[in-house]
Amino acid sequence: KRFHDVLGNERPSAYMREHNQLNGWSSDENDWNEKLYPVWKRGDMRWKNSWKGGRVQAVLTSDSPALVGSNITFAVNLIFPRCQKEDANGNIVYEKNCRNEAGLSADPYVYNWTAWSEDSDGENGTGQSHHNVFPDGKPFPHHPGWRRWNFIYVFHTLGQYFQKLGRCSVRVSVNTANVTLGPQLMEVTVYRRHGRAYVPIAQVKDVYVVTDQIPVFVTMFQKNDRNSSDETFLKDLPIMFDVLIHDPSHFLNYSTINYKWSFGDNTGLFVSTNHTVNHTYVLNGTFSLNLTVKAAAPGPCPPPPPPPRPSKPTPSLATTLKSYDSNTPGPAGDNPLELSRIPDENCQINRYGHFQATITIVEGILEVNIIQMTDVLMPVPWPESSLIDFVVTCQGSIPTEVCTIISDPTCEITQNTVCSPVDVDEMCLLTVRRTFNGSGTYCVNLTLGDDTSLALTSTLISVPDRDPASPLRMAN
């Protein structure tokens, strides 16, 4: 059997196989050692007994999407049946005091591979016995502690495979310079040691994406905005836009990145090299926000002027260029890429990313201030608590709700939170009455809210002993 017979039905075209060469990966036309690594079809009854105590689940994730030329990292995590875990030696053990369907186990081990390897590898001083090999016959690399690695992971994509020895979690990084743009499929098959052979325990697949567009995301933050995720913001208060570029492999670390903003409110274009920008909308309505990100990224070099034709064709750089083209394969000249020649073959190419959002601007509470605090005299001679009136003004829209959070003087330990609807006139002047149990210094956070906004003000207040002569003070 060959690798492609074992590892999946996705058969890339000859063009894809030729032009998606992954560094360090091998062709899936290679032979698979079925004796050491048995192959089971889906639904084969043997899967049921491939692992003691249940099925192992493999979870495959990636940091896709990847900008072409950058590295994409795949991670596989094995999830064992309940009460099982991998110990420091790579053995699979039962968790202490954990009860599964079978009850508590007397044997601490699910799989004691340390004992197995000591038994089976004694025949050869090098430890390189015929079974310590991958499915294609390549020997296991002898990293320190490699004997504690009891799982064999076979990654398969684009007609190529990569083999890795590991523990219950592995990571593999692939450079995407030669990968065709668009969605691609990664398949992983996991085997475990079983005496002098291996047993399949899990298969998993996931789609990843390679793109020539810089993956861009914009977070928006505005003071007093009640819900930052609804793309509704307040008039007359600055919105902070922060551009996040998805670049987990730091491919663009040394690139100059330009940000070109159009806020959709006829304020023109704003160009910046800073990933954050503030903008204030002064009118209500719906606006179309557009951002274009431009980065000079490492890229393929344009082919040099053609030399005298050799007798035998050699692969040209055109094949490398193809990998950047999201259209169907064509000659290099079809590729509308901006290329700039830089000495010693480190060429750069301008990559672009786009972000568009429709944002709604509405009236909101812009500001809130406590302008006066008054101790309310009670009819009882020595009341247990103090009633305090906070006279509050606000600017902007009419609040519908007031909340007070009363806490300790550090403003960290909340003692009491009270929210209630308020009726406020157009002048936006209101009095909030709150009870304070006992004298002392309190931190008072007072927020006024409406449907779209939440404005906060804070003060420290010193509540005196209930001696009528002692006045109420703002502690700050």
């Epitope: 009419i398 007070t404 009491n416 209630s420 609807p421 409406d450």
Partner: antibody, heavy 116, light 110 residues
Framework: EVQLLESGGGLVQPGGSLRLSCAAS????????MSWVRQAPGKGLEWVSS????????YYADSVKGRFTISRDNSKNTLYLQMNSLRAEDTAVYYC?????????WGQGTLVTVSS | QSVLTQPPSASGTPGQRVTISCSGS????????VSWYQQLPGTAPKLLIY???QRPSGVPDRFSGSKSGTSASLAISGLRSEDEADYYC???????????FGGGTKLTVL
């Protein structure tokens, strides 16, 4: 002069629906929160629901949550109460009132009778 | 069973001073304004006191409100026969997220 005029009350069978209206005049309706309060025959006052001036915030008594819906049309200066799945215990005079932290003006009420 | 507790009835003779109490908790009376409503027989309720002790214009100063801790009181001095009505206290309850009323006090002028 502030005026609140309720309408839409009447006799309805259990499980039935009714929509009450409250026409407001004499003040800038869109600047005020509005509420519904009811009073069963011979009983005390029971708050039913309140809505903010813009209609974005709504509160309901537990006894009507999921069955009643408060709404408003500021262009028509009208407050509504849509009552579904009515029960015998919803029988009451329904008052429309201005504001929600206190009720400073009240309508004359409309009687809703739920009976088979 | 009302969240705010009022005596079911109270009485007094003309000219006398009568007090009606209203008891609650820190989530309503303790931290929110109390209002008092008067309901004359066969009519809609009318606001008598708001913000614990404030009188709307047109309400005689014979009516006064006060609050201490989690209790509130309505005092009517110089009682008149036209004061015979049901009186309700009310406040927002921040725990229930609801406006709550007392059960009402029937005032009889003897």
């Amino acid at each position: 002069e502030v005026q609140l005029l309720e309408s839409g009350g009447g006799l309805v069978q259990p499980g039935g629906s009714l929509r009450l209206s409250c026409a407001a005049s004499g003040f800038t309706f869109s600047n005020y929160a509005m509420s519904w309060v009811r009073q069963a025959p011979g009983k005390g006052l029971e708050w039913v629901s309140s809505i903010s001036h813009s209609g974005g915030s709504k509160y309901y008594a537990d006894s009507v949550k999921g069955r009643f819906t408060i709404s408003r049309d500021n262009s028509k200066n009208t407050l509504y109460l849509q009552m579904n799945s009515l029960r015998a215990e919803d029988t009451a005079v329904y008052y429309c009132a201005r504001k929600w932290s206190t009720f400073d003006y009240w309508g004359q009420g409309t009687l809703v009778t739920v009976s088979s | 069973q009302s969240v705010l507790t009022q005596p079911p009835s109270a009485s007094g003779t003309p000219g006398q001073r009568v007090t009606i109490s209203c008891s609650g908790s820190s989530s309503n009376i303790g931290n929110n304004y109390v209002s008092w409503y008067q309901q004359l027989p066969g009519t809609a309720p009318k606001l008598l006191i708001y913000a614990d002790s404030q009188r709307p214009s047109g309400v005689p100063d014979r009516f006064s409100g006060s609050k201490s801790g989690t209790s509130a009181s309505l005092a009517i001095s110089g009682l008149r026969s036209e004061d015979e009505a049901d009186y309700y206290c009310g406040a927002w309850d921040s725990s229930l997220n609801a406006y709550v009323f007392g059960g009402g006090t029937k005032l009889t002028v003897l």
